[in-house]
């Protein structure tokens, strides 16, 4: 039975050109994490394999950095990066757990209503 739960960073609003960290944390299970996939809609961004380490998809190599931990750092954000991101935890023996984060990237000039944007 799958008893685990995924906690995420929560949805994030950030400025164009900035960078953000996407993170998920699997808790309430003793299952072994064998691999974590990071995906955006239908695109694979990166894989962190327990044995083989990190692999970043070639099309994202310039803007995606592994970590911290099993998380992912997105750099040089563009408005086109707006969308849903998935952390997919492959575990044994439980199976697959998925977390979801929505990233909204705003034009730098848009500081609407005094919004506090994330630029770590």
């Amino acid at each position: 039975m799958m008893t685990g739960t995924i906690e995420t960073t929560g949805n994030i609003s950030a400025e164009k050109g900035g960078s953000i960290i996407l993170q998920c944390h699997l808790s309430s299970t003793t299952a072994q994490v064998t691999q974590v996939n990071w995906e955006q809609q239908d695109q694979l961004l990166a894989i962190c394999n327990a044995d083989l380490g990190w692999h970043i998809s070639p099309s994202f190599k310039d803007r995606v950095a592994p970590g911290p931990g099993l998380g992912l750092t997105l750099q040089s954000l563009t408005v086109n990066d707006t969308g849903e991101y998935f952390c997919i935890y492959h575990t044994y023996p439980d199976g697959t757990y998925t977390g979801r984060i929505f990233l909204e990237v705003l034009e730098s000039s848009v500081a609407e209503h005094g919004a506090r944007f994330q630029i770590p």
Partner: antibody, heavy 119, light 112 residues
């Protein structure tokens, strides 16, 4: 002035599908998410999902995955929600509502589209 | 999904009263950058819902200053300092920090 104009009320038969429209005006359409909200029995509100017209990115409440499909026509500043395989549980008022940038809130709302599913 | 619990379900008031509506979430609504996406809405009969407060405590444009929001983490409050006839209706809170976004069950503000 921001305006969201939704299509009119619908009476449909169980098993049918339906496409509701939401035409936006008065702002830069592609720069804001468009969200859809369901109100059943005149009370509880449920977030169905959103679409970002700039790149077509979507995010759905998994409860509505397979039930609702969001699309956009940038040339006419119109967002659509298709509801599939309708049952009496889908009878409700559906609202389109613009996302408030930077805050994941809903700032402007359409007038609502009443959907009645009945044989 | 994050469960959002609103209390009370019904709130009988007299004009001029000060009232508070509570909204509690099953997990923290602060994201990893410390931003909390909690908003409040008023739904009047025959109208569409309208945004009152966003980001816990920011009044939306045109919203009178008798409306205020406060709270943090999992516990939030909407306060109306002096009830007027146009304030009657259903009030909802919405969390936008976690997918899917979830609404509270609503509080009906009605005359005594």
């Amino acid at each position: 002035e921001v305006q969201l104009q939704q299509s009119g009320p619908e009476l449909v038969k169980p098993g049918a599908s339906l496409k509701i429209s939401c035409k936006a005006s008065g702002y830069s359409f592609t720069g804001y998410t468009m969200n859809w909200v369901k109100q059943s029995h005149g009370k509880n509100l449920e977030w169905i999902g959103l679409i970002f017209p700039y790149n077509g990115a979507t995010s759905y409440n998994q409860k509505f995955q397979g039930k609702a499909t969001l699309t956009v026509d940038k040339s006419s500043n119109t967002t659509y929600m298709e509801l599939l395989s309708l049952t009496s549980e889908d009878s409700a008022v559906y609202y389109c509502t613009r996302g408030l940038r930077g805050y994941f809130a809903l700032d402007y709302w359409g007038q609502g589209t009443s959907v009645t599913v009945s044989s | 999904d994050v469960v959002v619990t609103q209390t009370p379900l019904s709130l009988p008031v007299s004009f001029g009263d000060q009232v508070s509506i509570s909204c509690r979430s099953s997990q923290s609504l602060a994201n990893s950058y410390g931003n909390t996406y909690l908003s409040w809405y008023l739904h009047k009969p025959g109208q569409s819902p309208q945004l009152l407060i966003y980001g816990i405590s920011n009044r939306f444009s045109g919203v009178p200053d008798r409306f205020s929001g406060s709270g943090s983490g999992t516990d939030f409050t909407l306060t109306i300092s002096t009830i007027k006839p146009e304030d009657l209706g259903m009030y909802y809170c919405l969390q936008g920090t976690h997918l899917p976004w979830t609404f509270g069950g609503g509080t009906k503000l009605e005359i005594k």
